[in-house]
Amino acid sequence: GITIPRNPGCPNSEDKNFPRTVMVNLNIHNRNTNTNPKRSSDYYNRSTSPWNLHRNEDPERYPSVIWEAQCRHLGCINADGNVDYHMNSVPIQQEILVLRREPPHCPNSFRLEKILVSVGCTCVTPIVHHVQ
Amino acid sequence: GITIPRNPGCPNSEDKNFPRTVMVNLNIHNRNTNTNPKRSSDYYNRSTSPWNLHRNEDPERYPSVIWEAQCRHLGCINADGNVDYHMNSVPIQQEILVLRREPPHCPNSFRLEKILVSVGCTCVTPIVHHVQ
């Protein structure tokens, strides 16, 4: 087993400045062994609200690379293949958990972080504000 | 600070049967303090590929509640408000990290787990397979 480092600069479970410290086994268990999330990989092109994927990279974070969706158009693609601005392409966002070393450079001490990522885009009817 | 439980049924950092154990601070830092993920909360109704949100709850998991999207229709909503089956509503999926208590009921001992969640739905042009 791994011994939590005794480096005085790295926190231990008794440290009052390191609240709500828990032990986590980093051997990731995959609940979706029979599913392939990549089966939806071409939706970004086939969608009426298509999106591009941009690489968000941070080596100090796990996962280090997160692919972020950016909607290609303000409007949506209609049956003729043109952009219809009476509809709106909007990003679908989700908060995900990531790990970050804290303090930096301590090998076995981490902090959970929540980040908001855009996963894809959907086509919505716009909210129309009527002028009184 | 929290003391790692000495309950003999719960592992500690020296436990050889609990490999790659690290300390994680659960005081979650939110990188998106200026963003409100709920601003997109009505997209599920306004989308041309609307979805219902189902509560997936598991007290042994963190986060214990995850909202899962299920597309309401096979097709997409057209300009007349009817379902157009020439298009398909499909779920946008993403793999996310969660923490699972392991062994169960141990308050400060977790395992990383990867699960596939449906975040929302988008409307796509179907793939047509032509019979030769």
């Epitope: 980093l26 591009n52 690379v65 070393r101 | 990290l97």
Partner: antibody, heavy 124, light 109 residues
Framework: QVQLQQSGPGLVKPSQTLSLTCAIS??????????WGWIRQSPGRGLEWLGR?????????DYAVSVKSRITINPDTSKNQFSLQLNSVTPEDTAVYYC??????????????WGQGTLVTVSS | DIVLTQSPATLSLSPGERATLSCRAS???????LAWYQQKPGQAPRLLIY???NRATGVPARFSGSGSGTDFTLTISSLEPEDFATYYC??????????FGQGTKVEIK
């Protein structure tokens, strides 16, 4: 099952361009769950990653700093293959060159499928 | 770039013995992005372990990986004749930082 088949000349003259091709079967060069890379191996340098291509709504190219100014990796979607071009070669570029599939999920990264390797000698 | 230092350079053991191979990184790497490969003469490397501790498909249970931070270990619990080969660790820190160790050769004593 996924297989990678390499082809290309085994002898290249100094200052010329080294060109190799890797044909993919059982997967797609445009797959969004993989990246396609080149790695070389020589007694002096050991295993050295050279670069990769991956497709995520557009093509991404990543090259090792050591060869960045001389390398190009291109996809050929019509033939489901990708190629390596290394310009201005010197005898130090003599090595066994491997193409490989890099599993590129958000949570893991590793090379699970390798080509058979091509010994390229740079000599006049 | 992160340097991976493998030790020992050569390990002389007999079939049935336990082999412990070390891989030390010059700075912290995410264990999830640490892999081990086996290579036999004239062959391409073969994936053994990914994510520091996950066995690849078809890899026998006698192979196991462990470690985090800067120190990683590949263990072969009981050497079989076909296990005598060279073993490499590999890390991915970022899209432009991917390096291999120099290898440990496991030879028959």
């Amino acid at each position: 099952q996924v297989q990678l088949q390499q082809s290309g000349p085994g002898l290249v003259k100094p200052s010329q361009t080294l060109s190799l091709t890797c044909a993919i079967s059982g997967d797609s060069v445009s797959s969004s769950s993989a990246a396609w890379g080149w790695i070389r191996q020589s007694p002096g340098r050991g295993l050295e990653w050279l670069g990769r291509i991956s497709y995520r709504s557009k093509w991404y190219n990543d090259y090792a700093v050591s060869v960045k100014s001389r390398i190009t990796i291109n996809p050929d979607t019509s033939k489901n293959q990708f190629s390596l071009q290394l310009n201005s070669v010197t005898p130090e570029d003599t090595a066994v060159y491997y193409c490989a599939r890099e599993v590129d999920s958000m949570y893991y990264s590793y090379f699970d499928i390798w080509g058979q390797g091509t010994l390229v000698t740079v000599s006049s | 770039d992160i340097v991976l230092t493998q030790s020992p350079a050569t390990l002389s053991l007999s079939p049935g013995e336990r082999a412990t191979l070390s891989c030390r990184a010059s700075q912290n790497v995410w264990a999830f992005y640490l892999a081990w490969y086996q290579q036999k003469p004239g062959q391409a490397p073969r994936l053994l372990i990914y994510g520091a501790s996950n066995r690849a498909t078809g890899v026998p249970a006698r192979f196991s990986g462990s470690g985090s931070g800067t120190d990683f270990t590949l263990t072969i619990s009981s050497l079989e004749p076909e296990d005598f080969a060279t073993y490499y660790c590999q890390q991915y820190r970022s899209t432009l930082s991917l390096t291999f160790g120099q290898g440990t050769k496991v030879e028959i004593k």
